[in-house]
């Protein structure tokens, strides 16, 4: 079972019977990418969440199936769930950012990310941790994670706690942290880039 398939299933299982019915009706009219067919109405309307997940994956494959599911959820007003689903499917085997949709993941990049390369220096030298937390909150940090970092007494311990969550992040999530660092302490990033 693929990661995206499991994420689609959990999203659909979270819908009430009424919402699942609405989801199926919207699926019948949602715009599709060129080359993809529509799931037949007769079969679609009788499906439960598990059957529908399998049908979405067999018709659209995992990645597009998840994107399509997220589009329909968003159209239903379920923005948070849609965002989490879309973020999860950009993750591969990593953990999904919480809440807000992450931008599409760029092509795989070789080597370590900047924040992994400079972990020790960032723990020692970042002073504006609150800025980072506010920038990451709802995008890659859950409320619990946000509060856990804030509860730490010193900047290094805050950063150490923040880094305890990064093994589960994908490249895009780490880019968000790097962007926040550039905005809050650009001189530090420039210094580390030169080193």
């Amino acid at each position: 079972m693929g990661r995206a398939r499991d994420a689609i299933l959990d999203a659909l299982e979270n819908l009430t019977a009424e919402e699942l019915k609405k989801f199926k009706l919207k699926l019948l009219s949602v715009p599709l990418r060129e080359g993809y067919g529509r799931i037949p109405r007769g079969a679609l309307l009788s499906m439960d969440a598990l059957d529908l997940t399998d049908k979405l994956v067999s018709f659209y494959l995992e990645t597009y199936g998840a994107e399509l599911t997220a589009n329909v959820l968003r159209d239903m007003g379920l923005q948070e769930m849609a965002g989490q689903l879309q973020a999860a499917t950009h993750q591969g085997s990593g953990a999904a950012p919480a809440g807000i949709q992450a931008p599409p993941q760029s092509a795989a990049k070789p080597g370590l990310h900047f924040i992994d390369q400079h972990r020790a220096a960032l723990i020692a030298r970042v002073t504006n941790v609150e800025w980072l937390l506010d920038a990451l909150y709802g995008k890659v940090l859950t409320d619990e994670q946000y509060q856990a970092v804030r509860a730490e007494p010193t900047n290094p311990s805050k950063m150490r706690k923040l880094f305890s969550f990064t093994p589960a992040w994908n490249w895009t999530c780490k880019d968000l942290l790097l962007q926040a660092l550039r905005e809050s302490q650009s001189y530090l990033v420039e210094d580390l880039e030169r080193s």
């Epitope: 979270n14 009430t16 019977a17 919402e19 990593g94």
Partner: antibody
Framework: QVQLQQSGAELARPGASVKLSCKAS????????INWVKQRTGQGLEWIGK????????HNNENFKGKATLTADTSSSTAYMDLRSLTSEDSAVYFC?????????????????WGTGTTVTVSS | DIKMTQSPSSMYASLGERVTITCKAS??????LSWYQQKPWKSPKTLIY???SLADGVPSRFSGSGSGQDYSLTISSLESDDTATYYC?????????FGSGTKLEIK
């Protein structure tokens, strides 16, 4: 902090039913699943089933079909398990446990937080 | 159902000793394997998830490894507080199934 507070011990007659509760606090109840686990005295752990609190959808272990019914009340952030037609085999400690979803974690449906446990004793 | 075979069922070890507990699944569980510690009359406590990730607040002497069907929990240097029963759980496929447990005691 995140807590799952379970209801107090139950003493029931054979054939009766009991309803156990698991009150969640410290997080958004609808963004995680809830599992129920059985442990007989001196024995191992057995998964009963899971519920998606937002929708009420459930998945039960076949061994507990007809025995355990899982429900959730989002307004009070409480999950419930009804155990019916009780026999001495149902005497056990029952735990609830929280799980993240597949679109929320790298490892969905593992049990990240456990409840305090409820002891059920079935005796005539 | 996926069967989880956990070994040993019980063991004695000395303080400071390296301890390893294993779990074998009857089929590939794709690292959807977690480990739990339970002390008498207490709720279980999560130690490891996704086979190798350390849960919040768990001492670094605990580690998990493995993939496919074979997984292990290692305590690098046993402490007196580690006396407990340890369980593995596969949660990749319903019904979720636990190992039978390993009771760990100090020599």
């Amino acid at each position: 902090q995140v807590q799952l507070q379970q209801s107090g011990a139950e003493l029931a007659r054979p054939g009766a039913s009991v309803k156990l509760s698991c009150k969640a606090s410290g997080y958004n109840f609808t963004t995680y699943g809830i599992n129920w686990v059985k442990q007989r005295t001196g024995q191992g752990l057995e998964w009963i089933g899971k519920i998606y609190p937002r929708s009420g959808n459930t998945h039960n272990n076949e061994n507990f079909k007809g025995k355990a019914t899982l429900t959730a009340d989002t307004s009070s952030s409480t999950a419930y398990m009804d155990l019916r037609s009780l026999t001495s085999e149902d005497s056990a400690v029952y735990f609830c446990a929280r799980s993240p979803y597949a679109f929320y974690s790298s490892s969905y449906w593992y049990f990240d937080v456990w409840g305090t446990g409820t002891t059920v004793t079935v005796s005539s | 159902d996926i069967k989880m075979t956990q070994s040993p069922s019980s063991m004695y070890a000395s303080l400071g000793e390296r301890v390893t507990i294993t779990c074998k699944a009857s089929q590939d569980i794709k690292s959807y394997l977690s480990w739990y510690q339970q002390k008498p009359w207490k709720s279980p406590k999560t130690l490891i998830y996704y086979a190798t990730s350390l849960a919040d607040g768990v001492p670094s002497r605990f580690s998990g490894s493995g993939s496919g069907q074979d997984y292990s929990l290692t305590i690098s240097s046993l402490e007196s507080d580690d006396t407990a029963t340890y369980y593995c759980l596969q949660h990749g496929e319903s019904p979720f199934t636990f190992g039978s447990g390993t009771k760990l005691e100090i020599k």
